[in-house]
């Protein structure tokens, strides 16, 4: 990785399958300093799950969260 991860939390892997939409309460993007772009979905149990922003289901979930 060209960037140090010491200074900002980064995702180094993405969840393989979609989470149930109902389990997600919010999202945020990891820092631009991270080598891998990622969306972090926060579940209702407060787990932070890394997802690939290029995946269709991820974009759909983001749109849904923005609308709600």
């Amino acid at each position: 990785s060209p960037y140090s991860s010491d200074t900002t939390p980064c995702c180094f892997a993405y969840i393989a399958r979609p989470l149930p939409r109902a389990h997600i309460k919010e999202y945020f993007y990891t820092s631009g300093k991270c080598s891998n772009p990622a969306v972090v979905f926060v579940t209702r149990k407060n787990r932070q799950v890394c997802a690939n922003p290029e995946k269709k289901w991820v974009r759909e979930y983001i749109n849904s969260l923005e609308m709600s």
């Epitope: 939390p9 180094f12 892997a13 993405y14 969840i15 579940t43 407060n46 787990r47």
Partner: nanobody, 124 residues
Framework: EVQLVESGGGLVQAGGSLRLSCAAS????????MGWFRQAPGKEREFVAR????????YYADSMKGRFTISRDNAKNTVYLQMNSLKPEDTAVYYC?????????????????WGQGTQVTVSS
């Protein structure tokens, strides 16, 4: 059965150092982050640092940077926390934990497995 066993805690004077160890067994942890948390009496458990088991990528809580160093030895299935320039406010029970690699691994809720903890006491 997954087991995380911490050791290396104890009583140390302010300004001193300790190295905590966490021996992991019971599964393959290559797809996990290993993290250290601490909990002082009457306070919530707080994140200290985490390391990717296979990647070695690290992340530290802001307040720990510079004094604490997390590392791992894959051959020994052990994760370490080197703590230098210890202060009385570092007194706490220190816990080792494991989080799936697809999480950000910076909050307690990201972690699936926990050790029993090791007490660190820093006297002034």
């Amino acid at each position: 059965e997954v087991q995380l066993v911490e050791s290396g805690g104890g009583l140390v004077q302010a300004g001193g150092s300790l190295r905590l160890s966490c021996a992991a067994s019971g599964r393959t942890f290559s797809s996990y982050y290993m993290g250290w948390f601490r909990q002082a009496p009457g306070k919530e458990r707080e994140f200290v640092a985490r390391i990717g088991w296979s990647s070695g990528s690290t992340y530290y809580a802001d307040s720990m940077k510079g004094r604490f160093t997390i590392s791992r030895d894959n051959a020994k299935n052990t994760v370490y926390l080197q703590m230098n320039s210890l202060k009385p406010e570092d007194t706490a029970v220190y816990y080792c934990a494991a989080a799936p690699r697809y999480t950000l691994a910076t909050v307690t809720y990201d972690y699936d497995y926990w050790g029993q903890g090791t007490q660190v006491t820093v006297s002034s």
